[in-house]
Amino acid sequence: FERTRSLQDPCSNCPAGTFCDNNRNQICSPCPPNSFSSAGGQRTCDICRQCKGVFRTRKECSSTSNAECDCTPGFHCLGAGCSMCEQDCKQGQELTKKGCKDCCFGTFNDQKRGICRPWTNCSLDGKSVLVNGTKERDVVCGPSPADLSPGASSVTPPAPAREPGHSPQ
């Protein structure tokens, strides 16, 4: 038999890692292997998440907490709790429906994920371009043209209009 020292609802006595087993006179049964309950008083244990394929295990499941996944090398997490893995691209690229594509002129991406973003328009802040942008790096803005020595000039190309980057379905 199972003894508990509570006069209230017997299920409220069931701690994390157990569930209130209605099939067995509401005793607190331990969660079976590959399942967990993270809070007390639960009527069922949840099935542990399995990190398979492109997912790999970052934290093992236990009787009181779910497994946590991340992505295998060459992929990165997307969504709450790493619900998806998305392919990495190189810096200077973005992921499209057709795969990794170089950033268009006037845009950059300094990460292995995400979309190419327009270079900063230095002139909007009244500044000039100190270091030109590349596919991998944003421009570096410097002092305003008025602060430069006579004859010096700087041209900031306008950011081209472009469609937002795509992610795989």
Epitope: E2, R5, N25
Partner: antibody, heavy 122, light 109 residues
Framework: EVQLVESGGGLVQPGGSLRLSCAAS?????????PCWVRQAPGKGLEWIGC?????????YDANWTKGRFTISRDNSKNTVYLQMNSLRAEDTAVYYC?????????????WGQGTLVTVSS | DIQMTQSPSSLSASVGDRVTITCQAS??????LAWYQQKPGKAPKLLIY???TLASGVPSRFSGSGSGTDFTLTISSLQPEDFATYYC???????????FGTGTKVTVL
């Protein structure tokens, strides 16, 4: 080193009481590891006595035959579990094992102590 | 209460033999069954859990199967160190659910 060490066994008269201890080292009892007691009378099979939830709750799971004579308790600060045995009889003579019942091993006993002998005799 | 019945209670076999031990539960316990090996004067050793999963460090000649009420432990090719007593145990917690089987002693033929 991960181990369980029982102590407290010995000779006791019928009707007497005894408290066995089981000290865990190298791991802590938790919701994933329940301490349990199992006994084995001389020349006989294994007999499950009971287990206690490994976390902070005091839920115990006992074999029906214990009829309240045997009580399992735990001191988390000492990482030790106890078996209080009252109204002992000659048929309680056995080697008493402490075991760890592990969620990771399907609640099987994946770690056992060396056992402590309890002899009930006048 | 759950009762566990093992058969046979004893058997004699030779090195290299295939040995099968059965365990029957008095009610369904799904796959919540463990198998142990015990040698004289020693504590039991976990061989198999969840009816068919081999415990760490256990040789692959040991295997388990079954679900519900009927379970089997098989030793594919008996080795000298396998002569021992084997026990099944329900790991279906609560209501006297963790009972051991009656044991099977494997001796040299």
């Amino acid at each position: 080193e991960v181990q369980l060490v029982e102590s407290g066994g010995g000779l006791v008269q019928p009707g007497g009481s005894l408290r066995l201890s089981c000290a865990a080292s190298g791991f802590s009892f938790s919701a994933n590891y329940y301490p349990c007691w199992v006994r084995q009378a001389p020349g006989k099979g294994l007999e499950w006595i009971g287990c206690i939830y490994g976390g902070s709750s005091d839920i115990t799971y006992d074999a029906n035959w214990t009829k309240g004579r045997f009580t399992i308790s735990r001191d988390n600060s000492k990482n030790t579990v106890y078996l209080q045995m009252n109204s002992l009889r000659a048929e309680d003579t056995a080697v008493y094992y402490c075991a760890r019942s592990a969620w990771y091993s399907g609640w099987g006993g994946d770690l056992w102590g060396q056992g402590t002998l309890v002899t009930v005799s006048s | 209460d759950i009762q566990m019945t093992q058969s046979p209670s004893s058997l004699s076999a030779s090195v290299g033999d295939r040995v099968t031990i059965t365990c029957q539960a008095s009610q369904s316990i799904s796959n919540r069954l463990a198998w142990y090996q015990q040698k004289p004067g020693k504590a039991p050793k976990l061989l198999i859990y969840s009816a068919s999963t081999l415990a760490s460090g256990v040789p692959s000649r040991f295997s388990g199967s079954g679900s519900g009420t009927d379970f089997t432990l098989t030793i594919s090719s008996l080795q000298p160190e396998d002569f021992a007593t084997y026990y099944c145990q329900s790991t279906y917690y609560g209501n006297d659910g963790n009972a051991f089987g009656t044991g099977t002693k494997v001796t040299v033929l």
